[in-house]
Interface confidence: low
């Protein structure tokens, strides 16, 4: 892009800042809150979205209280930390000092503690599963449609490839989507499905994450696909850590 | 409907400069990789190289390093090769196609319709 | 750089027949390869990716298989219209690199 462009934005996270200062005039945006520089052909890591979600004003956000994740996402929204590649850090602290360690997800797998508590790594969630409930309609929807339709969608909309949507379930009116992505199968390039999960997540709330686009409008043989309800477990590569005290 | 509308045929004497244009329709041009192909008369296709159309950053193949290069207009969703000093062997059909942009996804999923550029004193 | 070999240059083959085009990588190219197919005066057309994904709208009679140097293209029941040049590309590294192409005509 040349400075005397104006369509300097980010079609895949408007929750940027673009301007064409970047080598040449290009077009360089910046995730809101961290202030990184993103690639803007690629989806944008779930840790610098949920970042810039917090730094956004206040009265600005139309944020849903993610009650729907209570069984897997029990602390919901908070402002993390992400490395220099925008990926979680293992550590995550609140301004009063109590530390927790994440999964690549962003969500927690150990007890809560102090500043001395150590997360050694990063551990990554290689199994995803995105339970959907759909609004009754007419009739079921033919599984292997509503399989192709879904598998399109995150080909194409997320550009997740095809590789890691390992299954699509189906038993009226619950659909179940499982990703799969180990350390070894994701190569340069590859989107990481806690990332597409969240795009995924973020769309079918209606909070769309990409810039301009329209909603989602996700359709089976033209009927409509409506979401009521969404759940979404994570599996990590490692077990988590919890005390048999918060497993009671 | 994803499309891409490649210029017109050219007819240029050696040394002369080409410049063909592919315009992108139907998807946001930022999103994918713009590549390009030679497809030589009766021979096979071979890969120029390609442009991340966010960054603007060009890769050639070896053998297309010097004479041939990548532009973008992205206002106009429209990718561009040049090609200087032509010689005669460059007359063949040129391919822009769309990729994503990692090794998983350099497979081209939609195609201009090609350009014949004749090099001819 | 990575040679994609189609060992036959033509394959004849009559409508209702099934049909496999072999590729050969001269490296491990995991399971990036894709398929075209190339009619005259048209440009290529994406069939399979990634060894052995069908592209959106392709007939489920075209399927793909194998991995790392070894490769087949499947057609289940020729049609009339399948009578093409089909390629083979790998798209595992760069330079990118197409086989040389499979013609397919008819007895």
């Known amino acids: 892009h040349t400075a005397a462009q104006d369509n300097c934005t980010c079609p895949t996270n408007k929750m940027t800042v673009c301007s064409p200062d970047g080598p040449g005039g290009r077009c360089q945006c910046r995730a809101l809150g961290s202030g990184m520089a993103v690639d803007c052909s690629t989806l944008t890591s779930k840790c610098l979205l949920l970042k810039a979600r917090m730094s956004a004003p206040k009265n600005a956000r139309t944020l849903v209280r993610p009650s729907e994740h209570a069984l897997v996402d029990n602390d919901g929204l908070y402002d993390p930390d992400c490395d220099p590649e925008g990926r979680f850090k293992a550590r995550q602290c609140n301004q009063t000092s109590v530390c927790w360690c994440v999964n690549s997800v962003g969500v927690r797998r150990t007890d809560k503690g102090d500043l001395s508590l150590r997360c050694d790594e990063l551990v990554r969630t290689h199994h995803i599963l995105i339970d959907l409930r759909h609004r009754p309609t007419a009739g079921a929807f033919n599984h292997s449609d509503l399989d192709a339709e879904l598998r399109r969608l995150f080909r194409e909309r997320y550009r997740l490839h095809p590789k890691f949507v390992a299954a699509v379930h189906y038993e009226q009116p619950t659909i179940q989507i499982e990703l799969r992505q180990n350390t070894s199968q994701k190569a340069a390039g590859d989107v990481d499905i806690g990332d597409a999960a969240y795009y995924f997540e973020r769309d079918i709330k209606g909070e769309s994450l990409f810039q301009g686009r329209g909603g989602l409008d996700l359709r089976v043989r033209g009927e409509p696909l409506q979401v009521e309800r969404t759940l979404i477990y994570y599996l990590d590569e490692i077990p988590p850590k919890f005390s048999m005290k918060r497993l009671t | 409907q994803i499309q891409l509308v490649q210029s017109g045929p050219e007819l240029k004497k050696p040394g002369e400069t080409v410049r063909i244009s592919c315009k992108a329709s139907?998807?946001?041009?930022?999103?994918?990789?713009m590549q390009w192909v030679q497809k030589m008369p009766g021979k096979g296709l071979k890969w120029i190289g390609w442009?991340?159309?966010?960054?603007?950053?060009?890769k050639y193949a070896e053998d297309f390093k010097g004479r041939f290069a990548f532009s973008l207009e992205t206002s106009a969703s429209t990718a561009y090769l040049q090609i200087s000093n032509l010689k005669n062997e460059d007359t063949t059909t040129y391919f822009c196609?769309?990729?994503?942009?990692?090794?998983?996804?350099?497979?081209?999923?939609?195609w201009g319709a090609g350009t014949a550029v004749t090099v001819s004193s | 750089d990575i040679v994609m070999t189609q060992s036959h240059k033509f394959m004849s083959t009559s409508v209702g027949d099934r049909v496999s085009i072999t590729c050969k990588a001269s490296q491990d190219v995991s399971t990036a390869v894709a398929w075209y197919q190339q009619k005259p005066g048209q440009s290529p057309k994406l069939l399979i990716y990634?060894?052995?994904y069908r592209y959106t709208g392709v007939p489920d009679r075209f399927t793909g298989s194998g991995s790392g140097t070894a490769f087949t293209f499947t057609i289940s029941s020729v049609q009339a219209e399948d009578l093409a040049v089909y390629y083979c590309q790998q798209h595992y590294i760069t330079p990118l690199t197409f086989g040389a192409g499979t013609k397919l005509e008819l007895k």
């Open positions: 196609a769309r990729s994503g942009f990692g090794s998983s996804y350099w497979y081209f999923d939609v």
């Open positions: 990634s060894a052995s």
């Open positions: 442009i991340n159309t966010h960054s603007g950053v060009p």
């Open positions: 139907g998807y946001t041009f930022t999103t994918a990789g």
